[in-house]
Each structure stands twice: as structure tokens, then as C-alpha cells.
Interface confidence: low
């Protein structure tokens, strides 16, 4: 009779993480008598996966009933596959011996490859805010995928970015892999509503890539522009001085009025109006009683925005003659009346 052959018909098997792997093995003869064992890897360091004769293997089930005398199918199923299960599995026939069974013949081996999905990409931006025209870096990370091949793209508002660097680790063979990418993004004044997107495509995702996003509203600081204007109101001895604070982001802003260098009033921006681009406008005003002044008055609007050094704009109020209209209040965003007479 022809000598027993151990046949593993599949050179490789590919399984998704969490699923069950079927490793096929048949023998061509019932002789010699003896058990089958499955190993991962070859040589002295091989790992026992299943022993027909003894042991407890909770994740392994046999395809056929191995207790039947004429059984020659030694295929097994391994449940709940993880990337750590990847490797080459050998079906090995043992010959009954005393005291120990003797290895008789091994199958050619079946390579088990595991497909694992990447984790959702996490995008993180710079720790501190930056102003328009500056370049900032964003990082994107995703972990736990297999096989190693993966594609990562960056987008800003749907436009693909080209300035980025990507690494997949580790470089050598591993049960699973991680990807890390850093993209450079130039900020513009219109970026309050912008998004940066990291998109990861992998064979396990069936053409439906994973995306991680970062809102540039968390990253950008748009400094305000200031304009101080005056015009007469009510009686001829009162002048309305306004400070228009335009196009700033985020909202955190404190305004101080100075009269000839002395603090007159400090207030925090509260009822602001929002522009279409996501920036804010705000206006503060003073009613100045010019009859109380013999000399010209230097009024300064000083703004501290988002913890940055203060910026200011000054206006010289002439008191030597009746005040004439000097500019006009073109802001439509008057949101509050803050009156104070200067004596």
C-alpha cells in the first residue's frame, strides 16, 4: 500500500479579524495508526495548536468527527481570529509509539494571514493657535491594521494636500501595523469654518475609507482690525466715539478705553455679531462731554484678543472749537450702549 501522505491543499488562507479560519488537512491512508497534531511554525520552537489525543483547545474545533475509525479528515477551525494568529500552520501525523508517539509525516503547511481593520484615524493639531499666513502641522494616527499596505490622504475642505509625511510601523513583519502622518497646512483668514481631514484606505474597508477630522476653528486665531470714529450726538457738547473691532476669532476679547493714557473703562466682548466666514465683529462706544475739557483729548481703544499682546487705535478729540463730524459710524453692528461722561 502507498505510504501515507498528509495533504494541506491550501497554500494560504486569509481571514478577517474576529472570524473563523478553516485549516484543511487530509491523510491518504489510515495506516500507521496514531494521532494528528497541529502546530504553528516549524522546528523546536513551534507552538501546539491542537492535539487530537489530549489537551484543551477552546478556540479549535474539528471539521470531522475524529473519533470515527475511518476518518482521514483532520481539518480544524480556529475561532475569533486576531492578527496574533498569523503564521504557517502544519498538520502533523504521529505514529503510535511507546512511551511517546513519534512524528511520522507533516503537511506542507498553510499560511494564515489575518486582515484587521485600522482604527478610526485620530487627527490632532498644534497645541497653540496660529494666525493666518502661518503654517501649522497636523498629525493623523491609525493602529491595528493588517496587512501592511495602506493608503493615507489629507484634505483641507475637500482639496487634497500634498505636503505631508507618512510612516507605517514597524518596518518588518508584524502581526499588525500603525500609521502616522504629519501634514503641513497654511492658514488663511477664511479658515474658521475649514476642516482638515485624514482619510485612510485599507483592503479591509471595501472601498469605504475611514476619516478623522480636525476643525481649524480650534487652531486659528484671526486678530482684529480696529477703527475709532467720532460724530456729534444729542447736544452740541457731546461726542459719540466708537471703536469698531472687526473680523476676529475666537470670541475671547477684552477692550479698554484710555483717556489721555488713563484707563477709563474695561469691558469684555459679549454680544458679538458673526460674519459669514465665522469671524466676529463687535463695537464699543463712549459719550464724551467735551465741555468738561479745555484741552484736546487723546482717546485710545485698546484690545487684548485671546491672551495676545494688546493692539490699540487712538483718536484725537479736538475741544478748542465746536466739534464737527469727523468720520461716520458705518458699523451696523451696534450691540450695546456704554455711556460715560468724562469730567
Amino acid at each position: 500500500e502507498e505510504e501515507l501522505q498528509v495533504i494541506q491543499p491550501d497554500k494560504s488562507v486569509l481571514v478577517a479579524a474576529g472570524e473563523t479560519a478553516t485549516l484543511r488537512c487530509t491523510a491518504t491512508s489510515l495506516i500507521p495508526v496514531g494521532p494528528i497534531q497541529w502546530f504553528r511554525g516549524a522546528g523546536p520552537g513551534r507552538e501546539l495548536i491542537y492535539n487530537q489525543k489530549e489537551g484543551h483547545f477552546p478556540r479549535v474545533t474539528t471539521v470531522s468527527d475524529l473519533t470515527k475509525r475511518n476518518n482521514m479528515d483532520f481539518s480544524i477551525r480556529i475561532g475569533n481570529i486576531t492578527p496574533a494568529d498569523a503564521g504557517t500552520y502544519y498538520c502533523v501525523k504521529f505514529r503510535k509509539g511507546s512511551p511517546d508517539d513519534v512524528e511520522f509525516k507533516s503537511g506542507a503547511g498553510t499560511e494564515l494571514s489575518v486582515r484587521a481593520k485600522p482604527s478610526a484615524p485620530v487627527v490632532s493639531g498644534p497645541a497653540a493657535r496660529a494666525t493666518p499666513q502661518h503654517t501649522v502641522s497636523f498629525t493623523c494616527e491609525s493602529h491595528g491594521f493588517s496587512p501592511r499596505d495602506i493608503t493615507l490622504k489629507w484634505f483641507k475642505n475637500g482639496n487634497e494636500l500634498s505636503d505631508f509625511q507618512t510612516n507605517v510601523d514597524p518596518v518588518g513583519e508584524s502581526v499588525s501595523y500603525s500609521i502616522h502622518s504629519t501634514a503641513k497646512v497654511v492658514l488663511t483668514r477664511e479658515d474658521v469654518h475649514s476642516q482638515v481631514i485624514c482619510e485612510v484606505a485599507h483592503v479591509t474597508l471595501q472601498g469605504d475609507p475611514l476619516r478623522g477630522t480636525a476643525n481649524l476653528s480650534e487652531t486659528i486665531r484671526v486678530p482684529p482690525t480696529l477703527e475709532v470714529t467720532q460724530q456729534p450726538v444729542r447736544a452740541e457738547n457731546q461726542v459719540n466715539v466708537t471703536c469698531q473691532v472687526r473680523k476676529f476669532y475666537p470670541q475671547r476679547l477684552q477692550l479698554t478705553w484710555l483717556e489721555n493714557g488713563n484707563v477709563s473703562r474695561t469691558e469684555t466682548a459679549s454680544t458679538v455679531t458673526e460674519n459669514k466666514d465665522g469671524t466676529y465683529n463687535w463695537m464699543s462706544w463712549l459719550l464724551v462731554n467735551v465741555s468738561a475739557h479745555r484741552d484736546d483729548v487723546k482717546l485710545t481703544c485698546q484690545v487684548e484678543h485671546d491672551g495676545q499682546p494688546a493692539v490699540s487705535k487712538s483718536h484725537d478729540l479736538k475741544v478748542s472749537a465746536h466739534p464737527k463730524e469727523q468720520g461716520s459710524n458705518t458699523a451696523a453692528e451696534n450691540t450695546g450702549s456704554n455711556e460715560r461722561n468724562i469730567y
Epitope: I7, P9, D10, K11, S12, V13, L14, V15, A16, E19, A21, T22, R24, T26, T28, V63, S64, N71, M72, D73, S75, S113, R115, V203, Q206
Partner: antibody, heavy 122, light 107 residues
């Protein structure tokens, strides 16, 4: 609804080439092994070739080895059979079929496409 | 290559009859066997896989048995729509091979 639609069949002269396509829909194509099986007029079924989910393993019948190439494009949900050096005995209806179990070897097949007729004649 | 031999090559039967088709493999294939039904001008349809597992949607009057080299497909009560050709197929070794087919005809 799971569907497999073959195309590319026709009349071709001996020695020429033909490429068959099989468009899959209604299931996750990238999870299943695929195969081509043919049936000569009035004859039984003959397995031609099989391919693993990711294209890493390809198997061929001895009668077509070296002449036919099975391939797949998972992004297009399409299976292909490139047939070169065609012979009169390759005349048959060619069916594409999908493996029953996900991520397994292409062992048994269901469903099958409606088939496309290849006629090799001078 | 594994040869798959089906018998009989054809069988005449009436509606309600019990029909048995056998398939023999030239060497042991454990339970790696499938049965298909094919009607004229149509693609084959899987009935049984793993020798005895009924494919979803297939009527329970179809059953499969056997292991190793000898396998049987049984139709417990033949229905009009069952008149067709039936093929067995081994699924353990490449090349995959089919039996020659059994035609079930109306008596």
C-alpha cells in the same frame, strides 16, 4: 440581490485571445473567493480556475494552465479570465461563480452567473 | 487528479418518487463534496455542500450523505421542478473535479 454578470464571450479564431469579465453586485466581493467553470455544448461541468479573495493564490485546470489567467479587481467588483492561444476544445459556456463562505478557499460555489458563450472556430 | 464517478447517468422517475443518486471519489475526500442542480439553459445551483449541509433556500426534500469516497444525494419526494441534471463536485484537492452528471427525467 446577489448578481454575477459575465461578458466578453463571442466567436474567435484558434490561436487568438479573448478576455471575459464578471461584474459582481449585491455582496462584498472582496470577501469571497471566485472561480470560472465551463461547460462544453451538451457536456458536463469543468472547473477552469479559482482565485483567492485578494488574488494571492490562483489555481488552474491542467487543460488551461499557461494559456489562461484569472484575476480580479476588488475596487471594481470584477473578476476576469484572460484566455490566450484559444483552441477548438475551449468552446463552451463560461460561468463565473463565487465561493459560499467568506474568506475560505473557493471550494463550493453559489451563486453562479448566467454564463457567456465562447466559440473557437476558424 | 481525483475522478468523480456518478451513477446512474440518467434516471426516469415520477412525481412523488424517492430518487437516489450516488457519487464515488477515486480517493478519500472526507466530507468535501457538493451537489448541484442544473436545468437546461440555466446556470448550476448549489444544493448541498460539505456532503450533508443544505444550502439556504433549498427545499428540505433534498439531502446528502456520505464521507470518504461514497456519497449520496436523495430527493425524498420528487417534484415537477426537480427534473434536471445533478452534478457532484469534490472540493478538497486542486484541480476541483465534477462528476459526469445524472439526468433526472420524467417517466
Amino acid at each position: 440581490e446577489v448578481q454575477l454578470v459575465e461578458s466578453g464571450g463571442g466567436v474567435v479564431q484558434p490561436g487568438r485571445s479573448l478576455r471575459l469579465s464578471c461584474a459582481a453586485s449585491g455582496f462584498t466581493f472582496a470577501h469571497y473567493g471566485m472561480a470560472w467553470v465551463r461547460q462544453a455544448p451538451g457536456k458536463g461541468l469543468e472547473w477552469v480556475a479559482s482565485i483567492w479573495v485578494d488574488g494571492s493564490n490562483k489555481y488552474y485546470a491542467d487543460s488551461v494552465k499557461g494559456r489562461f489567467t484569472i484575476s480580479r479587481d476588488n475596487s471594481k467588483n470584477t473578476l476576469y479570465l484572460q484566455m490566450n492561444s484559444l483552441r477548438a476544445e475551449d468552446t463552451a459556456v463560461y460561468y463565473c461563480a463565487t465561493a459560499v463562505e467568506t474568506y475560505s478557499g473557493p471550494n463550493w460555489f453559489d451563486p453562479w452567473g448566467q454564463g457567456t458563450l465562447v466559440t473557437v472556430s476558424s | 487528479d481525483i475522478q468523480m464517478t456518478q451513477s446512474p447517468s440518467s434516471v426516469s422517475a415520477s412525481v412523488g418518487d424517492r430518487v437516489t443518486i450516488t457519487c464515488r471519489a477515486s480517493q478519500g475526500i472526507s466530507s468535501w463534496l457538493a451537489w448541484y442542480q442544473q436545468k437546461p439553459g440555466k446556470a448550476p445551483k448549489l444544493l448541498i455542500y460539505a456532503a450533508s449541509s443544505l444550502q439556504s433556500g433549498v427545499p428540505s426534500r433534498f439531502s446528502g450523505s456520505g464521507s470518504g469516497t461514497d456519497f449520496t444525494l436523495t430527493i425524498s419526494s420528487l417534484q415537477p421542478e426537480d427534473f434536471a441534471t445533478y452534478y457532484c463536485q469534490q472540493a478538497i484537492y486542486f484541480p476541483i473535479t465534477f462528476g459526469g452528471g445524472t439526468k433526472v427525467e420524467i417517466k
